[in-house]
Amino acid sequence: RAVPGGSSPAWTQCQQLSQKLCTLAWSAHPLVGHMDLREEGDEETTNDVPHIQCGDGCDPQGLRDNSQFCLQRIHQGLIFYEKLLGSDIFTGEPSLLPDSPVGQLHASLLGLSQLLQPEGHHWETQQIPSLSPSQPWQRLLLRFKILRSLQAFVAVAARVFAHGAATLSP
């Protein structure tokens, strides 16, 4: 594990995997299905979707003082998106295109979350509703919206790990 007993993570490993996540999130976005992009408007996601915010300790000072606050927040987000990508939203009709990187993205989210999960320590994770949207048009649009939210999330996470790898690695 990268965070044995709650000490520092393997920053370089996390940096590499988070950069891969960024690439996959951007490449997955246009490949989740054919749709009319007019719905790709300017609506904001709400606070129910994990964001990395000022009070989460992900700034350089916060990471220096105690990186656990920030890492827990990132871990919660990774689990949130990992569950969504494994849900019926992505597995139900309409089927993903054969060359969609969503499967790889799902596996990489799980991989990074495992790197961050301390041995014998279980961070609280956000509850994901167990019931799926029932209509294909809903799933198709939600895929775009979820991936767009995920892009923003992993971009911030990647910056955190890049900073950690550059300044906090042993």
Epitope: M35, D36, E39, E43, T45, T46, D48, V49, D88, G92, E93, I128, P129, S130, L131, S132, P133, S134, Q135, P136, W137, Q138, R139, L140, L141, L142, K145, I146, S149
Partner: antibody
Framework: EVQLLESGGGLVQPGGSLRLSCAAS????????MEWVRQAPGKGLEWVSY????????IYADSVKGRFTISRDNSKNTLYLQMNSLRAEDTAVYYC??????????????WGQGTMVTVSS | DIQMTQSPGTLSASVGDRVTITCRAS??????LAWYQQKPGKAPKLLIY???SLESGVPSRFSGSGSGTEFTLSITSLQPEDSASYFC?????????FGQGTKVEIK
Amino acid sequence: EVQLLESGGGLVQPGGSLRLSCAASGFTFSHYTMEWVRQAPGKGLEWVSYIYSSGGWTIYADSVKGRFTISRDNSKNTLYLQMNSLRAEDTAVYYCARDIPTSSAGAFDIWGQGTMVTVSS
Amino acid sequence: DIQMTQSPGTLSASVGDRVTITCRASQSISSWLAWYQQKPGKAPKLLIYKASSLESGVPSRFSGSGSGTEFTLSITSLQPEDSASYFCQQANSFPPTFGQGTKVEIK
């Protein structure tokens, strides 16, 4: 008993605002995706807006986008529709509806009784 | 948007008759079609989902069939309480759209 109960309708002038509420009971509201559907007097049904079960993502019909905002408070088992910049063509009975909670269905299984919104000067 | 066209607009039939309503989609929607019944001043009630699945509690005289672009709702033995408007709805593509409705009257 599974139930949806809308409120907040009324008469409003063009350009005005209204906030509709839909109180849910008899089911675990936070697990369900919800919608608003409207019906102009003597006309057919028109889908208006959708919100994901956690409230994280919303979708709107082109006719209301930028003017209406759907939201929910899962702790209060309530769905909302904030309607701004109302127009005469928004005059309708507004229904909240629940999605069937299975990916192989594709329909609205529970509807409220509706609340009438009249936009007129 | 996918256009849903119902026919006939109105139909009048006697108690015990078999009644059929047709719904046509402007493009293929696979089997993603639902049928609703609406009585005056009331909310719509789901009858059929996924083209042919009967909603729980709906009498077995109601049935749905079809796929692609052409769908039918049948009532095998019309009852007085079936006097209502019937709407089809496609759930395949954004935005979800409804047919204009068919009014069923009892002679």
